[in-house]
């Protein structure tokens, strides 16, 4: 029961996390204009991974996509890649984990298969969460670097022939969404890995010798029973018969009530 709960909770947490990663990736507010001590009061700039937006003081908002690949900073491209990889891995992980859920029965799928799938999805969620956290952190680092560079420009760039000031940008809402979502996906993945351990009972092999009182009904092979996790071939603990050790009169005989231990 605890295993089912852990697995189910891990799935739900990961689902929320991946939804958050998708939301963060699509959001426009990855970086927002720093309004502190900024003279430009008529416009408010903010940017996402895919487009740049401007909100005028009149309330009019306009966005324009980055219709180029070569003109974009390499770091932005790297962040895009990390977020997409995170989403893809997370989506595959969700798909795998749906089939791995203990509460869902699909045909005659054994616990061993479910354990393997749970572990696979758990690892996928962990990697997905790490990708999102890495992507957001790389972007945040880029903002911090640009912030201090533009602050330096603000005071040194005003004396030359061309007075250039780079608007300072600070963390947007998408960064916080991404960090939280990545963390949730990571936690969900860890929970799935923990649940996997509970789904796969330890395999114990032991020899079982059967004794029977009735004459020559069935010849048994020692070690006829095997307790299995399902990773082996004898998954149903069926009796293993030695079909070749029969006498002439065994062909006619019927099993007695003592034949099965």
């Amino acid at each position: 029961m605890a295993v089912t709960a852990c697995q189910g909770l891990g799935f739900v947490v990961s689902l929320i996390g991946i939804a958050g990663i998708i939301a963060a990736t699509c959001m426009d507010q990855w970086s927002t204009q720093d309004l502190y001590n900024n003279p430009v009061t008529a416009v408010f700039n903010y940017q996402g991974l895919w487009r740049s937006c401007v909100r005028e003081s009149s309330g009019f908002t306009e966005c324009r996509g980055y219709f180029t690949l070569l003109g974009l900073p390499a770091m932005l491209q790297a962040v895009r890649a990390l977020m997409i990889v995170g989403i893809v891995l997370g989506a595959i992980g969700l798909l795998v984990s749906i089939f791995a859920l203990k509460c869902i029965r699909i045909g005659s799928m054994e616990d061993s298969a479910k354990a393997n799938m749970t572990l696979t999805s758990g690892i996928m969620f962990i990697v997905s969460g790490l990708c999102a956290i890495a992507g957001v952190s790389v972007f945040a680092n880029m903002l911090v670097t640009n912030f201090w560079m533009s602050t330096a420009n603000m005071y040194t760039g005003m004396g030359g022939m061309v007075q250039t000031v780079q608007t300072r940008y600070t963390f947007g809402a998408a960064l916080f969404v991404g960090w939280v979502a990545g963390g949730l996906t990571l936690i969900g993945g860890v929970m799935m890995c923990i649940a996997c351990r509970g789904l796969a009972p330890e395999e114990t092999n032991y020899k079982a010798v059967s004794y029977h009182a009735s004459g020559h009904s069935v010849a048994y092979k020692p070690g006829g029973f095997k307790a299995s996790t399902g990773f082996g071939s004898n998954t149903k603990n069926k009796k293993i018969y030695d079909g070749g050790a029969r006498t002439e009169d065994e062909v006619q005989s019927y099993p007695s009530k003592h034949d099965y231990v």
């Epitope: 974009l72 640009n146 061309v162 780079q166």
Partner: nanobody, 122 residues
């Protein structure tokens, strides 16, 4: 790079008018939002007026509303500020600035002119 050069400043009597121009070179300012700022002696830089890259969305500081008019001519790559009913407190160095509207995945740049002095005195 965008180079901005202001002109049209000078001495004017209270109640008088002036028209400031800001000529851009180096790059067309058709994709840049443009602003006028001013800095009075011993004071900080103050926003005066804004106009977006299309020539719409004009916004003014409360102190100049109904007296100043911002406009631009993208074909001439020039920004204007028509100042009417000038007062003594309008005395300042006036700067024009071009603000990059849609930067490509990095913080936008602001380009500033050297400024032109406007003195309102009787």
């Amino acid at each position: 790079q965008v180079q901005l050069v202001e002109s049209g400043g000078g001495v004017v009597q209270p109640g008088g008018s002036l028209r400031l121009s800001c000529a851009a070179s180096g790059r067309a300012i058709g994709t840049y939002d443009t602003n006028w700022y001013r800095q009075a002696p011993g004071k900080g830089r103050e926003f005066v007026a804004f106009i977006n890259y299309r020539g719409g969305g004009a916004t003014y500081a409360d102190s100049v509303k109904d007296r100043f008019t911002i406009s631009r001519d993208n074909s001439k790559n020039t920004l204007y500020l028509q100042m009417n009913s000038l007062r003594a407190e309008d005395t300042a160095v006036y700067y024009c600035a071009a603000h990059e509207r849609f930067p490509m995945g990095r913080p936008p740049y602001d380009y500033w002119g050297q400024g032109t002095l406007v003195t309102v005195s009787s």
